[in-house]
Interface confidence: low
């Protein structure tokens, strides 16, 4: 083996590298010193190296390492940033859209519904995307409130157009009589199926998306300890107290050393690949009822057949409603 | 009031949406994500590899340094850390992850198991009790390629799905939600999609 | 005539609850968002929680969440609110608030007269 | 959540004079289909709030044309031409575009 060269007779050359990490040359001795206080760099002879100097090079070397990490994570970082920003806005505009259809399918086919129709589909809409980013409501309770709030603009202007205008505080009565008669057949459960599960996937989608934002954010800005900073600074650094400036660390010495510094994140190693996989399994589910696009865009379709339903029937409805809500005629609200 | 958009006029000839084949779709982008995706599936576990090879390495040279001393680089001291005494590289792993790195993998493990709860057998599109009322409009078939026909005048025939992003700036919204102002200023007399 | 009459406010010890309500008149009831909003002694506005016209959607402010319930009765025309663990800091003049339409998400056209509330041991 | 700053905790002005009051919002009020949401109330003494403006430039009925709003998606004014004795009170901005609904702190027109 060979003799490691002798130490720069003056420290110079440590000086001059020194005096880039930390401008004034107060830390570094003039010539080698026994160097007896250093705690990580410990020499075998004279050294041009001081306490304080070890200290800056720690903090550099966990510095680098930080650095090091959030270089080798950038392109999974922007890879999920874009992809979660891309679709949540794409999901919006699904949701955009598939609200102008419904709209479109009144403003067509029962404008006597509109403006009322405009405003409940609105809402609907509104807490479809709500719903998406995360807010706790409740699918079915949506699905039951555009019906619910449907049902009497329907039976005032489609089904008993001539109801004198004092008799048009039957809301809640109607609202209730649309429940119980089940006055829109199975088509507002049909929808509760449809929406309930095409949003839970897309929610649960943009939820995990957003996580993986997370795990990368969290190991990005990770604190390295400070056995973990001797460590690195060992490895990078003590080699200049020699006044070996050029020399590099060992491959494997290398490899040691990092997977003793990323002991704890590289536990998250079995979870971050089961994440992958299981997000693969979502997506590779993601169509027809678990799609929200085609869901969300058939809605109108939907929603058309279920007043074709009600005004199929009409006729019996409306003697049954007349019976139930004739009461609440009478009463105003006011 | 202008709440209501009252010029939104929609001529029933034209609310055609646009077939539009190899378009990219949603679905198409998603299956991308994840192809991507799967290339770092090893992020984790290759970490302390990737530091290494972009942080200075001895590679060409004959010798390197051991964190003690100057050795030749194929040499068994090449491997060793020369820190025999000082630092236990062992109790460092020992010593298990960061309280924040626990909790990034309790979070993981949560959903995880979402993702896995969600993940749906691939059969009957439709529940069976759904087929109950004898729906006249027809429901989707397994073997149907969509189930967002139209019934009626005037219905908007969806061929096939949104072209991805077709247009961010295309809106006719009827309503303002969450402001809720609902004034319109329709862009087109044609809800279409697509574009050109 | 658009009216809305707060009632219910008094003194109370902090941990203790009470219930406010709103009676409503002057427009249907029924078809319209509602809200409470407070100014408390330092005269600034707080929004505390919102209710949808069919009342399937509550919204609260963080700092009541847990202890405060918002609900309506469409039939009696009325709105309420239901405090419970109250704290100092809940002190104010609680308002009733309408919105412009039946959402959610319209803005707030007619205010109540107030009513007040005094947490204090 | 957004927060909505008025600088100004009062401003003086004389009967007949014009004067404007300003909020800044922490995020953009304006919302995708072009509708900025930023709404302006006025508390008289001893009474409640009332809408004077919404949407950001948009004048509440019964308000008299003297007032008007205007801005920018994170800026605001509301300016008053000729004030009158009438307007003197507190004037609160507000956002309506997310929950939590948040208020400005007031700011309060006093008459020299």
């Known amino acids: 083996q060979p003799p490691p060269p002798p130490p720069d007779a003056t420290c110079h050359q440590v000086r001059s590298f020194f005096q880039r990490l930390q401008p004034g040359l107060k830390w570094v001795p003039e010539t080698p010193v026994p160097g007896s206080d250093l705690q990580v760099c410990l020499p075998k002879g004279p050294t041009c190296c001081s306490r304080k100097m070890e200290e800056k090079y720690q903090l550099t070397a966990r510095l680098n390492m930080e650095q090091l990490l959030q270089s080798a994570s950038m392109e999974l970082k922007f890879l999920i940033i874009q992809n979660a920003a891309v679709f949540q806005e794409a999901f919006e505009i699904v949701v955009r859209h598939a609200k102008n259809y419904t709209n479109a399918m009144f403003k067509n086919n029962y404008p006597s519904l509109t403006p009322q129709a405009f405003e409940f589909v609105g809402e609907f809409f509104t807490d479809v995307s709500l719903y998406i980013l995360g807010s706790d409501i409740n699918v079915d309770d949506m699905v039951n409130e555009l019906f619910d709030s449907l049902f009497p603009v329907i039976y005032t202007q489609l089904m008993n157009p001539g109801l004198p205008d004092s008799a048009l505080d039957i809301n809640e009565c109607l609202r209730g009589a649309r429940r119980d008669l089940k006055v829109f057949g199975n088509f507002p459960k049909l929808i509760m199926t449809q929406v309930s599960k095409s949003l839970q996937v897309t929610r649960i989608f943009l939820q995990a998306l957003n996580l993986g934002i997370e795990v990368i954010n969290t190991t990005d800005h990770l604190k390295f300890s400070k056995d973990c900073g001797r460590m690195l600074t060992r490895m990078w650094y003590c080699s200049y107290c020699q006044g070996l400036m050029m020399v590099k660390p060992c491959g494997g010495y290398c490899n040691v050393v990092m997977q003793g510094c990323m002991a704890g994140v590289v536990e998250i190693d079995k979870y971050w690949r089961e994440y992958i996989l299981s997000l693969e399994e979502l997506v590779n589910g993601m169509y027809r009822i678990y799609d929200m696009e085609n869901v969300l865009l058939g809605l109108f379709s939907t929603i058309h057949d279920s007043i074709q339903y009600v005004q199929k029937n009409a006729g019996k409805l409306t003697t049954t409603i007349g019976k139930l809500c004739a009461h609440s005629q009478q009463r105003q609200y006011r | 009031s202008a709440y209501y958009p009252e010029d939104l006029f929609i001529d029933k000839k034209v609310l055609k949406v646009a077939h539009v084949e190899h378009e990219e779709t949603l679905s198409s982008r998603r299956r991308e994500l994840i192809q991507k995706l799967k290339s770092f599936i090893s992020f984790y576990s290759a970490l302390p590899g990737y530091i290494c090879s972009h942080s200075p390495v001895a590679e060409n040279d004959t010798l390197c340094w051991n964190g003690q001393e100057l050795v030749e680089r194929y040499s068994q001291k090449a491997a060793r850390n020369g820190m025999k005494n000082q630092f236990n590289l062992h109790e460092l792993k020992m010593k298990g992850p960061e309280p924040v790195v626990s909790q990034i993998i309790d979070k993981l493990k949560h959903i995880n198991q979402l993702l896995r709860t969600m993940s749906m057998p691939k059969g009957r599109v439709l529940d069976k009790n759904l087929d109950e009322e004898g729906f006249e409009s027809g429901d989707c078939g397994d073997d149907e390629d969509e189930c967002i026909g139209g019934s009626g005048d005037g219905m908007i025939k969806v061929k096939n799905q949104l072209r991805f992003l077709a247009e961010l700036a295309y809106d006719l919204d009827v309503d303002d939600a969450p402001g809720n102002s609902q004034q319109a200023t329709p862009k087109d007399n044609e809800i279409s999609t697509f574009h050109n | 005539e658009v009216q809305l009459v707060e009632s219910g406010g008094d003194s109370v010890k902090p941990g203790g609850s009470l219930k406010l309500s709103c009676a409503a008149s002057?427009?249907?009831?029924?078809?319209?968002?509602m809200s409470w909003v407070r100014q408390t002694p330092d005269k600034r506005l707080e929004w505390v929680a919102t209710i949808n016209s069919g009342g399937s959607y509550t919204y609260y402010q963080d700092s009541v969440k847990g202890r405060f319930t918002i609900s309506r009765d469409n039939a009696k025309n009325t709105l309420y609110l239901q405090m419970s663990s109250l704290k100092s800091e809940d002190t104010a003049i609680y308002y009733c608030?309408?919105?412009?339409?039946?959402?959610?998400?319209?803005?707030?056209?007619?205010w109540g007269q107030g009513t007040t509330l005094t947490v204090s041991s | 959540d957004i927060v909505m700053t008025q600088a100004a905790p009062s401003v003086p002005v004389m009967p007949g004079e014009s004067v404007s009051i300003s909020c800044r919002s922490s995020?953009?009020?304006?919302?995708?289909?072009?509708?900025?949401?930023l709404y302006w109330f006025l508390q008289r003494p001893g009474q409640s709030p009332q809408l004077l403006i919404y949407r950001m430039s948009n004048l509440a009925s019964g308000v008299p044309d003297r007032f008007s709003g205007s801005g920018s998606g994170t800026a605001f004014t509301l300016r008053i031409s000729r004030v009158e004795a009438e307007d003197v009170g507190v004037y609160y901005c507000m956002q309506h575009l997310e929950y939590p609904l948040t208020f400005g702190a007031g700011t309060k027109l006093e008459l020299k």
């Open positions: 608030v309408r919105h412009h339409y039946g959402s959610s998400y319209d803005y707030f056209d007619y």
């Open positions: 002057g427009f249907t009831f029924s078809s319209y968002g």
């Open positions: 995020k953009s009020l304006l919302h995708s289909n072009g509708n900025t949401h």
